[in-house]
């Protein structure tokens, strides 16, 4: 027994308390001081005395104590048996209860486990399904990647072969370039040799030119003498003719006194037999107004009426509208024939225009227009040109279609600026256009980067001012 206590209660009786697990048992036992003696027969129902007998001697007392002890032992044995019986029953009950309780708990736990297992199984099924889906998707991706890889591999192979081809081509070209370089070096060498030869030739030519210049000076002097002689001869011939006409006037009525033949242009002068270059008086049909013009009777078959000439910068070409209308300058030198005369002349029949140009390096070029005419003053003497040929540029340096004429006091151009004021001279300015043969005259070595000079763009570019220009006209059918 786990716990066994002996104590005294308030009425003097002995109290025994047994503790077993959660159960507690209490037994009340009578005092054994006046119990029967051991010699007396045992009577189970004998009444106990309330007051004990007193013995004087210790032996008797010891006897009594022994009896009490024996009695106590019997009681304890009975109690033990009783407890054991009771405990067995109780233990059986407790065990039964415990088993029942545990079974219930076990069933509950089992149920929970089953539920959890079912839940887990369901989750596992879901996961399995997901895994399957994922696996399928991955398999597809893998297949796609595999295909893509194959495709890329093929492309790489193609590119590799292409690279190889290009490398072959490149090496071939490199060889070719090297060969060309060698060839180029040889050519350069030969060019250098040619250049040296040319320099020798040029120096020879320079000395020849110097000699020729000297001869020209001599020839010019001789020419002047010859001209004087010719002039004298002409005077003599004229005098003779006058004398003859005077003496024959009565006999020949067809030559009236004071009669004068008029020419509209130099082509007519040429056709009349005057085939010498020089200044001639021209008159328009049905007009009394005369103009003096220079006639070129040699160039390209002759018969050319010069309408403009620049040669030395001796005449100022920054003139007014009126001056350009009627003309100005010196016909045997620099001059402008006059817009009005040219307009009327070119509207009576078809004319060609030839523009002859000279640069400061001794080069010459020309532009020939197969049809040329000027509008009237009311239309600002607008220029009309067709059919360009020549060596002074494949494109016309006079803007097409033609522009109105502008002067410093008549701004008819297409620029927000005033071209005539800025570039100087009267011209058929556009905005401002590729040409101006009436610009400022600049001497040699001062003729580049000049924007207001004598310009013909499609021969010499924008900033080059020319040495000389001549504008000439002639009937188209001449």
């Amino acid at each position: 027994y786990n716990n066994f206590r002996k104590s005294m209660d308030s009425i003097g009786k002995k109290q025994y308390q047994v503790q077993h697990g959660s159960c507690s048992y209490t037994f009340l036992l009578p005092e054994m001081d006046n119990c029967r003696s051991s010699s007396s027969p045992y009577v189970s129902n004998a009444v106990q005395r309330d007051a004990p007998l007193e013995y004087d001697d210790s032996v008797q007392r010891l006897q009594v104590l022994e009896n009490i002890m024996e009695n106590n032992t019997q009681w304890l044995m009975k109690l033990e048996n009783y407890i054991q019986d009771n405990m067995k029953k109780e233990m059986v009950e407790i065990q039964q209860n415990a088993v029942q309780n545990q079974t219930a708990v076990m069933i509950e736990i089992g149920t929970n486990l089953l539920n959890q297992t079912a839940e887990q199984t369901r989750k596992l099924t879901d996961v399995e399904a997901q895994v399957l889906n994922q696996t399928t998707r991955l398999e597809l991706q893998l297949l796609e990647h595999s295909l893509s890889t194959n495709k890329l591999e093929k492309q790489i192979l193609d590119q590799t072969s292409e690279i190889n081809k290009l490398q072959d081509k490149n090496s071939f070209l490199e060889k070719k370039v090297l060969a060309m370089e060698d060839k180029h070096i040889i050519q350069l060498q030969s060019i250098k040799e040619e250049k040296d030869q040319l320099q020798v030739l040029v120096s020879k030519q320079n000395s020849i030119i110097e000699e020729l210049e000297k001869k020209i000076v001599t020839a010019t002097v001789n020419n002047s003498v010859l001209q004087k002689q010719q002039h004298d001869l002409m005077e003599t011939v004229n005098n003779l003719l006058t004398m003859m006409s005077t003496s024959n006037s009565a006999k020949d009525p067809t030559v009236a006194k004071g009669e004068q033949i008029s020419f509209r242009d130099c082509a007519e002068v040429f056709k009349s037999g005057h085939t010498t270059n020089g200044v001639y008086t021209l008159t328009l049909p049905n007009s009394t107004e005369e103009v003096k013009a220079y006639c070129d009777m040699e160039a390209g078959g002759g018969g050319w009426t010069i309408i403009q000439r620049r040669e030395d910068g001796s005449v100022d070409f920054q003139r007014t509208w009126k001056e350009y209308k009627v003309g100005f300058g010196n016909p045997s030198g620099e001059y402008w024939l006059g817009n009005e005369f040219v307009s009327q002349l070119t509207n009576q029949q078809r004319y060609v225009l030839k523009i002859h140009l000279k640069d400061w390096e001794g080069n010459e070029a020309y532009s020939l227009y197969e049809h040329f005419y000027l509008s009237s003053e009311e239309l600002n003497y607008r220029i009309h040109l067709k059919g360009l040929t020549g060596t002074a540029g494949k494109i016309s340096s006079i803007s097409q279609p033609g522009n109105d004429f502008s002067t410093k006091d008549a701004d008819n151009d297409k620029c927000i600026c005033k071209c005539s004021q800025m570039l100087t001279g009267g011209w058929w300015f556009d905005a401002c256009g590729p040409s101006n043969l009436n610009g400022m005259y600049y001497p040699q070595r001062q003729n580049t980067n000049k924007f207001n000079g004598i310009k013909w763009y499609y021969w010499k570019g924008s900033g080059y001012s020319l040495k000389g220009t001549t504008m000439m006209i002639r009937p188209a059918g001449f």
């Epitope: 494109i395 340096s397 803007s399 620029c415 556009d430 905005a431 401002c432 256009g433 590729p434 924007f451 310009k455 763009y457 499609y458 570019g461 924008s462 900033g463």
Partner: nanobody, 115 residues
Amino acid sequence: EVQLVESGGGLVQPGGSLRLSCAASGFTFSDFGMSWVRQAPGKGLEWVSSITWSGGSTYYADSVKGRFTISRDNSKNTLYLQMNSLKPEDTAVYYCNADHPQGYWGQGTTVTVSS
């Protein structure tokens, strides 16, 4: 329609600086060389500076060499002239000009250098 519009002119003291601009339109600006040309009061046109179509080469009149700088921005169709250490003799109307067959010109911008 072709247009060249100069700007940036004004009154400046001797030794001062100005930057002229020329905005181009109506033609392919980047295909042509460009120039600055000036006209002093009562005088003729004087070439100042030129630049090639790409801006790779520049050229200057002796009178402005070392003081003026020409440049261009083909993406903005604009020509520039940076003028430093200005002198009274730089007083003029400044024109930009395209090295084009037409020789396009603007209306000019006036630069006055005076104390």
